[in-house]
């Protein structure tokens, strides 16, 4: 349904508050280095213009596309070339090339200072002094650091952020009330950002078909009572929503997401029995709740899959007539029966089934050829099951910190060319799979663990893509979306790697380490561990453990000393010498 003025249409649909917030997010995700005040000024100008179009849709420029309007506005930024370099060249292009150009320049790891949390009283004063600016600043800071953050979900985070300050700034103990809430929002926000980044990577690097396959599998697990046609409709709509958000069309995305939530709630009887509570909530909470809703119970007495997908004489005929639909039906039927499988495993099974049909349906006796296709699934299912079992045992034995360290060593040996901060960040996140998933019963472990690992490995892939240094990482990241984790798991020690030259400065520590939080101190130690492995890739677990134990004791001793700095200087030299001897450096 075409509208005379797209900007007026979206303003009316979304309302002024959401319109302004979404435009701010869009601008901050594109121009990640621009000061807050500049963005606010641009957003206000766009909003005023939108209001003129609401008043008269035939007014000048109101018929222009949102990309044209927003792109023109972004290109008025005076310091574009000084701040962004070649991104300024985007402004010489016409739509749609200009928007594509802006999208290509989104930076997953922008050179921005770490967000330091002020004192609680300072934050509460700022919140009370100008609530609107305070909340806009939150949107801006998150959006510029997470250029693919799911915009309608960021509105939900901002709503919770506001609620936390509204409640806690009146509390007797403001800090005790506020800090845990902010920690929770930060952790959930990072997780949400990473999950969305995988969706965008899936769409942008592997195409709509890959995303739709993922969505069929996930929604079929979640809504096993829904008919295939219903799941297909939801997948089509969900794909549109995420395509829009990943493409920077945030107003359309938020509008369509609201429509999808409305549709799901109006049709919950034919979708899932678990939606009732979600559908009673206000819009932002409703959409979030639906996205996180637990899997519905599987229908009783589902027939064997073999009847339709192996034994039927029409398998090849049906496949030939509508390949993707037939494969979609296979994926739907398999996924709704297997909430205990990861989505990526289900997609591997569907790929195996597709490859078998492609080969067998062109053979002289198709049925004879594909009759044993389900037997080929067994090793594919057992591989992640065994891996999760082994790693959960290791996690339970070591605890999170030491489990992370084991992964740090493992991954540094696999891909030692990758930058140390990236290896530390990714391995720490990989290690969190233990506390996140190993507590679950067997039936929930694989979907929790393997789908989480897909999200974390995508972080490695997007960070590596910015500055590629390892052919092995590139290969695992680009060959197959669903086989990324098995690809990385299969990597052995990189025998071609030339060890890094020893640099004493890397292992020099100062008294400032004593004032760091436990998390920051762990990161310091883990950074040193990665560097050790890069210097001595053939070091044994025992050697590395001995050095790390000595290092922990050294930090503990010097942090207790009266003259900490002298202790770090003198004991540090001894530690470096002892470590070199222990590792034969």
């Amino acid at each position: 349904d075409a509208h005379k003025s797209e900007v007026a249409h979206r303003f009316k649909d979304l309302g002024e508050e959401n319109f302004k917030a979404l435009v701010l997010i869009a601008f901050a995700q594109y121009l990640q280095q621009c000061p807050f005040e500049d963005h606010v000024k641009l957003v206000n100008e766009v909003t005023e213009f939108a209001k003129t179009c609401v008043a008269d849709e035939s007014a000048e420029n109101c018929d222009k596309s949102l990309h044209t309007l927003f792109g023109d506005k972004l290109c008025t930024v005076a310091t574009l070339r000084e701040t962004y370099g070649e991104m300024a060249d985007c402004c010489a292009k016409q739509e749609p090339e200009r928007n594509e150009c802006f999208l290509q320049h989104k930076d997953d790891n922008p050179n921005l200072p770490r967000l330091v949390r002020p004192e609680v009283d300072v934050m509460c004063t700022a919140f009370h002094d100008n609530e609107e600016t305070f909340l806009k600043k939150y949107l801006y800071e998150i959006a510029r650091r997470h250029p693919y953050f799911y915009a309608p979900e960021l509105l939900f985070f901002a709503k919770r952020y506001k609620a936390a300050f509204t409640e806690c700034c009146q509390a007797a103990d403001k800090a005790a009330c506020l800090l845990p809430k902010l920690d929770e929002l930060r952790d959930e926000g990072k997780a949400s950002s990473a999950k969305q980044r995988l969706k965008c990577a899936s769409l942008q690097k592997f195409g709509e078909r890959a995303f739709k396959a993922w969505a069929v599998a996930r929604l079929s697990q979640r809504f096993p009572k829904a008919e295939f046609a219903e799941v297909s409709k939801l997948v089509t709509d969900l794909t549109k929503v995420h395509t829009e958000c990943c493409h920077g069309d945030l107003l359309e995305c938020a509008d369509d997401r609201a429509d999808l939530a409305k549709y799901i709630c109006e049709n919950q009887d034919s979708i899932s029995s678990k939606l009732k509570e979600c559908c009673e909530k206000p819009l932002l909470e409703k959409s979030h709740c639906i996205a996180e809703v637990e899997n519905d119970e599987m229908p009783a007495d589902l027939p064997s899959l073999a009847a339709d997908f192996v034994e039927s004489k029409d398998v090849c005929k049906n496949y030939a007539e509508a390949k993707d639909v037939f494969l979609g039906m296979f994926l739907y039927e398999y996924a709704r029966r297997h909430p205990d499988y990861s989505v990526v495993l289900l997609l591997r099974l569907a790929k195996t089934y597709e490859t078998t049909l492609e080969k067998c349906c062109a053979a002289a006796d198709p049925h004879e050829c594909y009759a044993k296709v389900f037997d080929e699934f067994k090793p594919l299912v057992e591989e992640p099951q065994n891996l999760i079992k082994q790693n959960c045992e290791l996690f339970e034995q070591l605890g999170e910190y030491k489990f992370q360290n084991a992964l740090l060593v493992r991954y540094t040996k696999k891909v030692p060319q990758v930058s140390t901060p990236t290896l530390v960040e990714v391995s720490r996140n990989l290690g969190k799979v233990g506390s996140k998933c190993c507590k679950h019963p067997e039936a929930k472990r694989m979907p929790c663990a393997e789908d989480y690992l897909s999200v974390v490995l995508n972080q490695l892939c997007v960070l590596h893509e910015k500055t590629p240094v390892s052919d092995r990482v590139t290969k695992c990241c680009t060959e197959s979306l669903v086989n990324r984790r098995p690809c990385f798991s299969a990597l052995e020690v990189d025998e071609t790697y030339v060890p890094k030259e020893f640099n004493a400065e890397t292992f020099t520590f100062h008294a400032d380490i004593c004032t760091l939080s436990e998390k920051e101190r762990q990161i310091k130690k883990q950074t040193a561990l990665v560097e050790l492995v890069k210097h001595k890739p053939k070091a044994t677990k025992e050697q590395l453990k001995a050095v790390m134990d000595d290092f922990a004791a050294f930090v503990e001793k010097c942090c207790k000393a009266d003259d900490k700095e002298t202790c770090f200087a003198e004991e540090g030299k001894k530690l470096v010498a002892a470590s070199q001897a222990a590792l034969g450096l």
Epitope: F326, E358, C361, A362
Partner: nanobody, 123 residues
């Protein structure tokens, strides 16, 4: 919009041959499976043959296997059915068809179809 136009039907004696063509437009022909179905007077639709998008997979109904040959030209967006050793029971209106989103696979009443071309086998 999807358009399918069959041609090549006519009256033929038993044992004779015909070649049906179907010109397709309005959809991605080269990535779509295609089907020939037929309908004899007073009967329902009967599946005749299926060909995959890349022509690698071809299936025939038992009643026509060995006598009919389905083929396609993706460059020309055209589907063919070569019918040899025709029998009186092959008399029907022949339709080319393709899957319509939202329909059930094999539910040919719901597929996109052309207007059909009449084939009459009679001496």
């Amino acid at each position: 919009q999807v358009q399918l136009q069959e041609s090549g039907g006519g009256l033929v004696q038993p044992g004779g041959s015909l070649r049906l063509s179907c010109a397709a437009s309005g959809f991605a022909f080269s990535t779509s499976g295609m089907v020939w179905v037929r309908q004899a007077t007073g009967k329902g639709l009967e599946w005749v043959s299926t060909i995959s998008d890349d022509s690698r997979i071809i299936r025939y109904a038992d009643s026509v296997n060995g006598r009919f040959t389905i083929s396609r030209d993706n460059a020309e967006n055209t589907l063919y059915l070569l019918m040899n050793s025709l029998k009186p029971e092959d008399t029907a209106v022949y339709y080319c068809a393709t899957y319509r989103a939202g329909s059930r696979i094999g539910s040919y009443e719901d597929y996109y179809r052309g207007q059909g071309t009449q084939v009459t086998v009679s001496s």
